[in-house]
């Protein structure tokens, strides 16, 4: 039984970025017609995960999956049964809380981003990792890079693959 | 700052399996001198993740990261500060709770495995996904495959890369 997929292209890109797999990232970005500047921006984020090693991927994967499966992402209409989920009640929309976390990761301050993650009862080690990644992204990415990343995210959210 | 890594080769293999990345899996298995039958066994598990789609990776990634960051895997010695973690208080041992979960995934019944996952306050949708993956693995893998997977896990746990 295939389970409901919530904006699969988003998670494809996220996991490609977090796993440091450049080939997989390129393939995913091609699917959403990413421009060169958008690709460059995503690769800068990917570099941060690579530099911080495997534990960084595990811990940030925890952040993403915790938020994705939190109460915030399980609204009234989707809190029913697993049967409903199989029937794709979730639709293919990205969860608003995930969208917000990604938005803050790019546009917020490190304190704002860490505080957002902390709301999901994340362990200190997870929060520290979130701050390290956020600081790395802020150091590597220009304002233009961040705008390109946001424009790519818009493409992802509105893609038929979402 | 690089963060402490707990048996990184285990998580390398897990994420390669869960992400359906055969090349990455081959690379990781080469590092621990996996035999051909061991590789075959791991690829059968990988097939289950691929067949169940992206959401399966997200949800099972949640199981793994939830257990890995649970109280069971954060003994007294490592629950102190992020500084302690940076000093690698965690060691490089695989957490017993993770080991048990993987063991049950291969040798237990679907009910036993799901019950184990349920102890980590997993959502119904996560539990359903765990059952689907477990049923798939039981259907695909022979007893010999499972023995090969277990012998590979022993290699991973005792590897200098762990």
């Amino acid at each position: 039984v295939k389970m409901a997929e919530t904006c699969p292209i988003f998670y494809d890109v996220f996991f490609a970025v977090a796993n440091g797999n450049e080939l997989l990232l390129d393939l995913s970005l091609t699917k959403v017609n990413a421009t060169e500047p958008e690709r460059t921006a995503m690769k800068k984020i990917q570099d941060c995960y690579v530099e911080n090693g495997l534990i960084s991927r595990v811990l940030d994967g925890l952040v993403m999956t915790t938020i994705s499966s939190s109460k915030d992402c399980m609204g009234e209409a989707v809190q029913n049964t697993v049967e409903d989920l199989k029937l794709n009640t979730l639709g293919r929309e990205i969860c608003p809380a995930v969208k917000r976390g990604v938005d803050l990761f790019l546009t917020g301050t490190p304190d704002e981003y860490v505080e957002q993650v902390a709301q999901y009862k994340a362990l200190p080690v997870v929060l520290e990792n979130a701050r390290i990644l956020k600081n790395c992204v802020d150091a590597k990415m220009t304002e233009e890079d961040k705008e390109n990343a946001l424009s790519l995210l818009d493409k992802i959210y509105t893609s038929p693959l979402c | 700052v690089k963060m402490a890594e707990t048996c990184p080769i285990f998580y390398d293999v897990f994420f390669a399996v869960a992400n359906g990345n055969e090349l990455l899996l081959d690379l990781s298995l080469t590092k621990v001198n996996a035999t051909e039958p061991e590789r075959t066994a791991m690829k059968k598990i990988q097939d289950c993740y691929v067949e169940n789609g992206l959401i399966s990776r997200v949800l099972d990634g949640l199981v793994m990261t939830t257990i890995s960051s649970s109280k069971d895997c954060m003994g007294e010695a490592v629950q102190n500060t992020v500084e302690d973690l940076k000093l690698n208080t965690l060691g490089r041992e695989i957490c017993p709770a993770v080991k048990r979960g993987v063991d049950l995934f291969l040798t237990g019944t679907p009910d036993e495995y799901v019950e184990q996952v349920a102890q980590y306050k997993a959502l119904p949708v996560v539990l359903e996904n765990a059952r689907i993956l477990k049923n798939c693995v039981d259907a695909k893998m022979t007893e010999e495959d499972k023995e090969n997977a277990l012998s590979l896990l022993d290699k991973i746990y005792t590897s200098p890369l762990c």
Partner: antibody, heavy 120, light 107 residues
Amino acid sequence: EVQLVESGGGLVRPGGSLRLSCAASGFTFTSYAMNWVRQAPGKGLEWVSSISSYSSYIYIADSVKGRFTLSRDNAKNSLYLQMHSLRPEDTAVYFCAREGYSAYSYFDFWGRGTLVTVSS
Amino acid sequence: DIQMTQSPSTLSASVGDRVTITCRASQSVISWLAWYQQKPGKAPKLLIHRASSLESGVPSRFSGSGSGTEFTLTISGLQPDDFATYYCQQYNTYFPTFGQGTKVEVK
């Protein structure tokens, strides 16, 4: 020009039902989450419920949970609020509001409201 | 639920005055805070979102600041059109909550 027009308000007895509608125009309806916010006479604003672009995420205030149901019809650019078991404290002007960002959010455009009076 | 408390409840001011309204949250809302203006019989109008971002078309005399639990809305030179009730709203949670309102009236 963004326009939100509510309808369906009126006088209803306690325990009764009512269905409010909100007709949207001037923007791409499927790009936005939509909300209902109410305001009792002479009082402040109270959020009632929210629905995402494709109805995947529906959030309802505790005060109306189990009594109010939110839905949308993207083909008709319409938002609906089905209200059952109405109580005197549900008396208010009900505003339809668009979210300014498609995560739970602030409200960048509002309708003029429709008055619901629950009284015997 | 996150409680939002505005002060003062009523504020008497004259045209040209600098007016400051405070909004406190019962717990941190990070920077997820909006300010609205409402006139009698009308729908609220968005002024500021994300604590300090001015909505397009809103006069620059309106400004917002703060983060965490304490926020302020400032009107730098009150105009006749600014006499109204102002509400803050947190949207840190998926069930947003509003302050009780601050009425700015003619002194």
